[in-house]
């Protein structure tokens, strides 16, 4: 007969208030004949948690039927866990004795500690938008977890980031902890549709991490590029001039036409289209009345994007019967 071993596989068991805790204990031998009891703590002051033979333990149930002759599983469940239940639990084998049973061997013990799940991570981006090629900071916070050990990772579009700093507070003992992490992200022009993800893994989450997300669309500003062109065909005494505003984000945009420095109040036709990368294109058409007698006309397309300084593009129209495209230049 092999020597009796008392196996308590979990060194630490994290439980949540109100839930049921399962304390595992198996034996490798049925001998010597005698009961297995559960205690919290050691020494003369230890507290009896479960005795199959006698006593009233309303919150304790056994995982297996202990009356079965060949039972080797003495695991128990404790329901409605409270903070008062924390401590180290031992399954202890007794051999039959008289007048009392004699303690024979103890398991190594399982420490029961209260675990608290972290709150859902909240990711905050920068207060103001930034243009591509610049670095922006995102913060991630999660609170109320215990024990202190926690893992936090950052991802951008599924790719793990490495440029971040994380702090867990407080540094000393506490009933609950908080984590704060700041990640530095370099913006790319195509990041309108990108996401940053903060992932928090904790023992209480049983391998199912919590995630917080932020959309880079809230942090990025992609400035437009402008192009003004004159349509080659003339319709009567009107020429169609197009201002193409390309690849901008966000959508907020004001466009005005000027003719020889004078802002034109009349409406122009326009279309807004969205690109696959989430940026926008805006096309505006302006009809210019011309006559053979007029001086040359200089048209300016001015764009104010997302409250930034206006940018403009000029086009000089050559009013001749044989129109041809003129060179254009940009002014800030």
């Amino acid at each position: 007969e092999e020597e009796l071993q008392m196996i308590q596989p979990e060194k630490l068991l994290l439980v949540t208030v109100g839930k049921t805790a399962t304390l595992h204990c198996t034996v490798t031998s049925l001998l010597p004949v005698g009961p297995v009891l559960w205690f919290r703590g050691v020494g003369p002051g230890r507290e009896l948690i479960y005795n199959q033979k006698e006593g009233h333990f309303p919150r304790v149930t056994t995982v297996s039927d202990l009356t079965k002759r060949n039972n080797m599983d003495f695991s128990i469940r404790i329901s409605s866990i409270t903070p008062a239940d924390v401590g180290t639990y031992y399954c202890v084998k007794f051999r039959k004795g008289s007048p009392e049973n004699v303690e024979f061997k103890s398991g190594p013990g399982t420490e029961m500690a209260l675990g608290a799940k972290p709150s859902a991570p909240v990711v905050l981006g920068p207060a103001a938008r930034t243009t591509p090629e610049h670095t922006v900071s995102f913060t991630c916070e999660s609170h109320g977890f215990s024990p202190r050990d926690i893992t936090l990772k950052w991802f951008k579009n599924g790719n793990e980031l490495s440029d971040f700093q994380t702090n867990v507070d407080p540094t000393g003992q506490s009933v609950a902890y908080s984590i704060r992490s700041t990640a530095r992200v370099v913006l790319d022009p195509w990041d309108v549709r990108s996401q940053v993800i903060c992932e928090v893994a904790h023992v209480t989450l049983q391998g199912d991490p919590l995630r917080g997300t932020a959309n880079l669309s809230e942090a990025i500003r992609v400035p437009p590029t402008l192009e003004v062109t004159q349509q080659p065909m003339r319709v009567g005494n009107q020429v169609n001039v197009t201002c193409q505003v390309r690849k901008f984000y966000p959508q907020s945009l004001q466009l005005t036409w000027s003719e020889n420095g004078n802002v034109c109040q009349r409406e122009t036709a326009s279309t807004l289209t969205e690109n696959k990368d989430g940026t926008y294109n805006w096309t505006s058409w302006f009809l210019v009345n011309i006559s053979d007698q007029r001086d040359d006309v200089v048209l300016t397309c001015q764009v104010k994007h997302d409250g930034q300084l206006a940018v403009s593009k000029r086009l000089a129209l050559e009013v001749t019967v044989h129109q041809k495209d003129q060179s254009s230049d940009a002014t800030p």
């Epitope: 049925l30 001998l31 004949v33 005698g34 033979k53 051999r95 008289s98």
Partner: antibody, heavy 120, light 107 residues
Framework: QVQLVQSGAEVKKPGASVKVSCKAS????????ISWVRQAPGQGLEWMGW????????NYAQKLQGRVTMTTDTSTSTAYMELRSLRSDDTAVYYC?????????????WGRGTLVTVSS | DIQMTQSPSSVSASVGDRVTITCRAS??????LAWYQQKPGKAPKLLIY???NLQSGVPSRFSGSGSGTDFTLTISSLQPEDFATYYC?????????FGGGTKVEIK
């Protein structure tokens, strides 16, 4: 195989002593307790006492206290029951039985019994 | 001491009959009760332990129930080899005590 083999029948005079042996085989002797149970002719079962084959602790029935001694010899896997100052009402079949319950007491293996006759 | 009272002391029955034997403890013994079968000139044989657990090798026509003070042994369909004397035994505490026995006889 797993068994308990008891010593043979005895005839004793009143006032004498008897020592019955019970040899275990086929199992780990030290892992179990042994109880002794007797049965007078035509009567029911009467528990006499228990001994731990591991530690040697004993518990005897009140009415036999002082007259009975139970011992074990782990080297030979044998249990012994000695009854002194025999009386005619001690005439009975004496059984040894392996005690197998973990938190309780029951007997899953019995010897065939030893008849002890006390007669003048 | 815990007294064990068995009833009836004897019962006449035929092969195929359902037989029920009861055992009452003088105080609560949880489920620490065993049932034995004894045939003339033989040692007792364990049938049921811990009130309701069938000992290995015992036919399933034997069953036990009860808890606290009242317990029952049932033979669902009596077979010729079942004619014997049956004892209950409390194993809750020393001194261990047996019931007076129930003799199951052929009708």
């Amino acid at each position: 195989q797993v068994q308990l083999v008891q010593s043979g029948a005895e005839v004793k005079k009143p006032g004498a002593s008897v020592k019955v042996s019970c040899k275990a085989s086929g199992y780990t002797f030290g892992g179990y307790g042994i109880s002794w149970v007797r049965q007078a002719p035509g009567q029911g079962l009467e528990w006499m006492g228990w001994i731990s084959a591991y530690g040697g602790e004993t518990n005897y029935a009140q009415k036999l206290q002082g007259r009975v001694t139970m011992t074990t010899d782990t080297s030979t896997s044998t249990a012994y029951m000695e009854l002194r100052s025999l009386r005619s009402d001690d005439t009975a079949v004496y059984y040894c039985a392996r005690e197998a319950g973990s938190s309780w007491y029951d007997f899953d293996l019995w010897g065939r019994g030893t008849l002890v006759t006390v007669s003048s | 001491d815990i007294q064990m009272t068995q009833s009836p002391s004897s019962v006449s029955a035929s092969v195929g009959d359902r037989v029920t034997i009861t055992c009452r403890a003088s105080q609560g013994i949880s489920s620490w009760l065993a049932w034995y079968q004894q045939k003339p000139g033989k040692a007792p044989k364990l049938l049921i332990y811990a009130a309701s657990n069938l000992q290995s090798g015992v036919p399933s026509r034997f069953s036990g129930s009860g808890s606290g003070t009242d317990f029952t042994l049932t033979i669902s369909s009596l077979q010729p080899e079942d004619f014997a004397t049956y004892y209950c035994q409390q194993g809750a505490s020393f001194p261990i005590t047996f019931g007076g026995g129930t003799k199951v006889e052929i009708k």
